[in-house]
């Protein structure tokens, strides 16, 4: 129940990539505004995005405090210009979000191949260690800092002249693979958290090929 001129938010959805986390909902407001609250299961409610006409709220600053916690958010609806108004039950209309555990659920962002270097028949491929918005001791942590060995990378590599993709895996950010001498190869990487049951894989990195400026070739 609520006042006759407000409607409850619905379709509350968490959108999160590399811990950048936004709560989205519907409907677009007509003569109403929204305020969001977030809490952990055992914590107090904290208000964010006060009296907004947006249908999203950036909750990154709250969830990065402890990415392994489970969070719940709720969206309150108020009549525009009369935010003190409450529903018949004595409180504004609100809707709860699904629970959200950032460590288990944030999408893995598209990785980037930082460099590759060929030495003879070996190629060393390095994946950029992307910075997240998770802080420790006033510094931003990388994806590897946050996930540790839970995070692996899968490398796809193939001869420029063929289509079949070989794979290699690493729990660091570096691969050392064997290649055929005199052949040009292309590379793409995918971030994976195997211990998850959903959101296990990132999208593929942009493809990088030998003979382009990102790599380095050394004949030994």
């Amino acid at each position: 129940s609520g006042t006759t001129n407000t409607v409850a938010a619905y379709n509350l959805t968490w959108k999160s990539t590399n811990f950048k986390t936004i709560l989205e909902w519907e409907p677009k407001p007509v003569n109403q505004v929204y305020t969001v609250q977030i809490s952990t299961k055992s914590g107090d409610w904290k208000s964010k995005c006060f009296y907004t006409t947006d249908t999203e709220c950036d909750l990154t600053d709250e969830i990065v405090k402890d990415v392994k916690q489970t969070y719940l958010a709720r969206v309150f609806s108020y009549p525009a210009g009369n935010v003190e108004s409450t529903g018949s039950a004595g409180e504004p209309l609100y809707e709860n979000s699904p629970e959200f555990t950032p460590y288990l659920e944030t999408n893995l962002g598209q990785p980037t191949i930082q460099s590759f270097e060929q030495v003879g028949t070996k190629v060393n491929v390095t994946v950029e260690d992307e910075r997240t918005l998770v802080r420790r001791n006033n510094t931003f942590l990388s994806l590897r800092d946050v996930f540790g060995k839970d995070l692996i990378y899968t490398l796809y590599y193939w001869k420029s002249s063929s289509s079949g993709k070989k794979t290699a895996k690493t729990n660091t950010n570096e691969f050392l693979i064997d290649v055929d001498k005199g052949e040009n190869y292309c590379f793409s990487v995918q971030a994976v958290i195997p211990s998850r049951t959903v959101n296990r894989k990132s999208t593929d990195s942009p493809v990088e090929c030998m003979g382009q400026e990102k790599g380095e070739f050394r004949e030994i």
């Epitope: 692996i152 289509s163 079949g164 895996k169 995918q190 296990r200």
Partner: antibody
Amino acid sequence: EVQLVESGGGLVQPGGSLRLSCAASGFTISDYWIHWVRQAPGKGLEWVGYIDPQNGWTYYADSVKGRFTISADTSKNTAYLQMNSLRAEDTAVYYCARDYGSLTINLDYWGQGTLVTVSS
Amino acid sequence: DIQMTQSPSSLSASVGDRVTITCRASQDVNTAVAWYQQKPGKAPKLLIYSASFLYSGVPSRFSGSRSGTDFTLTISSLQPEDFATYYCQQHYTTPPTFGQGTKVEIK
């Protein structure tokens, strides 16, 4: 419960074609990789190929390259093995298996298999 | 491609026996080796992963070890349900490859 169910096997003449299906339940195939492995009667296991259903990328054993094609329909949570130009030596039980995708665990769940017989 | 050479191809043993099966990789595969058990008419089942880790639900009489490129599957005390064929497999590089199999039969 994780399950893989193959279907589509049967008797086919040399030079013919067959499409096998691998229907997955209990997990989303785009979060994993799917492999096909075959076993000729009385013989050992032979890896055929894999697909990453998320991007459609594949790799095949030399023995089937150019004749077999692995594909996936993520909306149906199903992988396929299209077999063309079949030969007598392709006669086998064909299994699909899920690749867990870690450094440590590879093929953790297998289907029950479907028999393909190539004979005139 | 990496070859996995498995031995013996078959062995006869009695219930309660200690059984050892070995696999040699043709080049370094780190610990990316799995062992599977297969019974007639059934799909293979994962027993050991990463050379020495027991997969969930597998009895503790099964164990795996690694020494360089040599990998061993040991059944400490053979049970009636263990009579089957066992395969090693490397997944260090593409294509993954299997050993030829070891059939464990009743003596």
